[in-house]
């Protein structure tokens, strides 16, 4: 009797279990009682990444330089093109359809994690003993200068945005 379910990598059509097309190929014609499924390779700018019965291959993603995108990995007949962002930019979503500039950490904040093509800069507040006096996408919080090691004394306390100011020690008169 005609099957009601088919094996893996097959599909049911007109009471026939037909082989699916392998990744990188599209369906031309379903199998019949007397013939196999017929498949054709996707063209150079197209792909199909699963066992399928698609009659059209998908177009490779276009990495649009006007949106700050560049090719990270060229697509094949079985895989889509992977885009990433140009230097100084990162993706706005997981699918990386557009890019935005990396965020800079404001004074008082330092870079905890430098941005990549797919993730933004992560900033952190400078803790006590550290400062950042610049807006930067690269600079970490820097430690306050140690006046003691220079045989100096603190003349002005540091903040999260400024370094300490060191000065000479007051000389004791006999």
């Amino acid at each position: 009797e005609p099957p009601t379910a088919c094996r893996e990598k097959q599909y049911l059509i007109n009471s026939q279990c037909c082989s699916l097309c392998q990744p990188g190929q599209k369906l031309v014609s379903d199998c019949t009682e007397f013939t196999e499924t017929e498949c054709l390779p996707c063209s150079e700018s197209e792909f199909l990444d699963t066992w399928n019965r698609e009659t059209r291959c998908h177009q490779h993603k276009y990495c649009d330089p006007n949106l700050g995108l560049q090719v990270q990995q060229k697509g094949t007949s079985e895989t889509d093109t992977i885009c990433t962002c140009e230097e100084g930019l990162h993706c706005t979503s997981e699918s990386c359809e557009s890019c935005v500039p990396h965020r800079s950490c404001l004074p008082g904040f330092g870079v905890k994690q430098i941005a990549t093509g797919v993730s933004d800069t992560i900033c952190e507040p400078c803790p006590v003993g550290f400062f950042s006096n610049v807006s930067s996408a690269f600079e970490k919080c820097r430690p306050w200068t140690s006046c003691e090691t220079k045989d100096l004394v603190v003349q002005q306390a540091g903040t999260n945005k400024t370094d300490v100011v060191c000065g000479p020690q007051d000389r004791q008169r006999a």
């Epitope: 082989s19 031309v28 014609s29 379903d30 019949t32 009682e33 007397f34 013939t35 196999e36």
Partner: antibody
Framework: EVQLQESGPGLVKPSETLSLTCTVS?????????WNWIRQPPGKGLEWMGY???????NYNPSLKNRITISRDTSKNQFSLKLSSVTAADTAVYYC?????WGQGTTVTVSS | DAVMTQTPLSLSVTPGQPASISCRSS???????????LNWFLQKPGQSPQLLIY???NRFSGVPDRFSGSGSGTDFTLKISRVEAEDVGVYFC?????????FGQGTKLEIK
């Protein structure tokens, strides 16, 4: 339901060309399947002659050498057989078939 | 070509009794995908062949379940579990794995 119907002359002279047409109803010959011509000489078995595919490409039995041509007219949903340089050995019942469905067959006699 | 040899060439069976027909190919009919395109047909007297079994063991729509097909590679069998009067005619196997497609020479089934 799919139906096939052969038509053409029942008598052909030796050395002439045998021409038959198969009219298909209930299914488009461009959708899928291979559309075959098969013959059966009197009192003998079945012989596959060739087919035309849904996409218009062909395959022929090498035993018929360069004598056979199968073509189609998609506007009429028909496919046709031409067999040249016929002899008495080509006398047979000629069937057009999708294999799951067959025409009723037409008798062709080769005689002067 | 794949030469198809059927045995026996004739068969006389009492109604209600089983019948078995063998078809042997000169080469394997299993293709590179593991599918085998071996079919069985019945040609009743004065009629066109009708499909009984396709791809070795699949009954075509409307074919009674007393007909079954089995086999693999080069050896295939058609079984009728209980022969009925309407089963008379010539049974053919046909392979469509390899071009040219080739038929067995036929087995004539008669009723005792």
């Amino acid at each position: 339901e799919v139906q096939l119907q052969e038509s053409g002359p029942g008598l052909v002279k030796p050395s002439e060309t045998l021409s038959l047409t198969c009219t298909v109803s209930g299914y488009s010959i461009t959708s899928n399947y291979y559309w075959n011509w098969i013959r059966q000489p009197p009192g003998k078995g079945l012989e596959w002659m060739g087919y035309i595919r849904y996409d218009g490409s062909n395959n022929y039995n090498p035993s018929l050498k360069n004598r056979i041509t199968i073509s189609r007219d998609t506007s009429k949903n028909q496919f046709s057989l031409k067999l040249s340089s016929v002899t008495a050995a080509d006398t047979a019942v000629y069937y057009c078939a999708r294999l799951d469905y067959w025409g009723q067959g037409t008798t062709v006699t080769v005689s002067s | 070509d794949a030469v198809m040899t059927q045995t026996p060439l004739s068969l006389s069976v009492t109604p209600g009794q089983p019948a078995s027909i063998s078809c042997r190919s000169s080469q394997s009919l299993e293709n590179t995908n593991g599918n085998t395109f071996l079919n069985w047909f019945l040609q009743k007297p004065g009629q066109s062949p009708q499909l009984l079994i396709y791809r070795v063991s699949n009954r075509f729509s409307g074919v009674p379940d007393r007909f079954s097909g089995s086999g693999s590679g080069t050896d295939f069998t058609l079984k009728i579990s209980r022969v009925e009067a309407e089963d008379v005619g010539v049974y053919f196997c046909l392979q469509v794995t390899h071009v040219p497609f080739t038929f067995g020479q036929g087995t004539k089934l008669e009723i005792k």
